[in-house]
Amino acid sequence: MAVTACQGLGFVVSLIGIAGIIAATCMDQWSTQDLYNNPVTAVFNYQGLWRSCVRESSGFTECRGYFTLLGLPAMLQAVRALMIVGIVLGAIGLLVSIFALKCIRIGSMEDSAKANMTLTSGIMFIVSGLCAIAGVSVFANMLVTNFWMSTANMYTGMGGMVQTVQTRYTFGAALFVGWVAGGLTLIGGVMMCIACRGLAPEETNYKAVSYHASGHSVAYKPGGFKASTGFGSNTKNKKIYDGGARTEDEVQSYPSKHDYV
């Protein structure tokens, strides 16, 4: 019951997180104009990953897409890529986790298969969350760098009393949405991984039986070496676990950490 609850909660938390990542990616307010030096501006600037907008005090808002690909900063491209990878992995993870849910029966799917799928989706959610957090953090770092650079030359004199105020940008709402969403996806992924351990069938506890072979007196534990060697007695063709350890075949079927680099 606790396993089902953990898995279900992990799924819901990840779902909310991925929805948040999608929302953050689409939002226009990744960076917003810093109003510290001009709190009474009649023009408010804000920028997203895909377009920049200007909201005039009249109520009119004008947004322009970044129609160039090569002309954009490499960092912005990197952030876009991280967010998209996060969304894609999260979406796949959601799809996998739906079939992995213990409360949903699909044919004669074994618990071991569901455990596999739960772990796979959990890892996908973790990587998805990390991608989102990384993307938002890279953008935030970019903002901080630009903020202090523009503060250094805030006013560029244009002769006499005339001055040009350079627009500075600060953290927009999308950054906070992204951080929270990434964190939720990460937590959901961890919960799925925890649920996976509980989903794996319990070990069948065999008592040690002594077999007296001629000339030798060796005690065997049927299936005792299965986890480490891939060999052992398993006459009923059931998977045998030794203290939660898995067969080599199973270990190979899971995505390794290198699959997501």
Partner: antibody
Framework: EVQLVESGGGLVQPGGSLRLSCAAS????????MHWVRQAPGKGLEWVSY????????YYADSVKGRFTISRDNPKNSLYLQMNSLRAEDTAVYYC???????????WGQGTLVTVSS | DIVMTQSPDSLAVSLGERATINCKSS????????????LTWYQQKPGQPPKLLIY???TRESGVPDRFSGSGSGTDFTLTISSLQAEDVAVYYC?????????FGQGTKLEIK
């Protein structure tokens, strides 16, 4: 057709109060930032006050700050300017104006004359 | 506050001739977000409310004759009437619409020579 009609002007003694109204028609007031602008007889234009579409942002000219209050009644499609502690220098024609592209005041009312005199 | 200074205070031009009015702001009106200058030009005839001619320093309001044009960027702006007509006699104002308070220039009175 967009129309702005001001009312409420008149003769008032110094220190007195007056409430100007601006009735809008032909558009929904709550979609736009609105302004009051005044013009003293024979003088130039002077911006007085601004209220944002959601009434969340309000600005005043330094000359009227603390004495004038701008407000709006979106269901009535009306804009108001409550003027207290009136002075002789507040004598002017008061216009309400609606801005749009580039913050330009694209529509103006015909104005209402406020005379502050003893 | 941004100070708007117009020149000249009054201008007399012959019919069909070019009229040029200048406007200078104490701070740049160029918004880096959209590379637009937040300056507007108005025309006011006696007994009438002002009429918007130009916004974003150079964009003509719909219905405004194409003999009216705006130019300039940053702090220096110009309103040009390419061929003066009798109906163009009025007072012209420039306005800062970039930062509150939204200040107007003192006005330029345009007359026929």
């Amino acid at each position: 057709e967009v129309q702005l009609v001001e009312s409420g002007g008149g003769l008032v003694q110094p220190g007195g109060s007056l409430r100007l109204s601006c009735a809008a028609s032909g558009f929904t007031l709550n979609n736009f930032g609105m302004h009051w602008v005044r013009q003293a007889p024979g003088k130039g234009l002077e911006w007085v006050s601004y209220i944002s579409s959601g009434s969340g942002t309000i600005y005043y000219a330094d000359s009227v700050k603390g004495r004038f209050t701008i407000s709006r009644d979106n269901p009535k499609n009306s804009l108001y300017l409550q003027m207290n502690s009136l002075r002789a220098e507040d004598t002017a024609v008061y216009y309400c104006a609606r801005a749009y592209y580039g913050n330009g005041f694209s529509f103006w009312g015909q104005g209402t004359l406020v005379t502050v005199s003893s | 506050d941004i100070v708007m200074t117009q020149s000249p205070d009054s201008l007399a031009v012959s019919l069909g001739e070019r009229a040029t009015i200048n406007c200078k702001s104490s701070q740049s009106l160029l918004n880096s977000g959209n590379q637009k200058n937040y300056l507007t030009w108005y025309q006011q005839k006696p007994g009438q409310p002002p009429k918007l001619l130009i916004y974003w320093a150079s964009t003509r309001e719909s219905g405004v004759p194409d003999r009216f044009s705006g130019s300039g960027s940053g702090t220096d702006f110009t309103l040009t009437i390419s061929s003066l007509q009798a109906e163009d006699v009025a007072v012209y104002y420039c306005q800062n619409v970039y930062s509150y308070p939204l200040t107007f220039g003192q006005g330029t009175k345009l007359e026929i020579k």
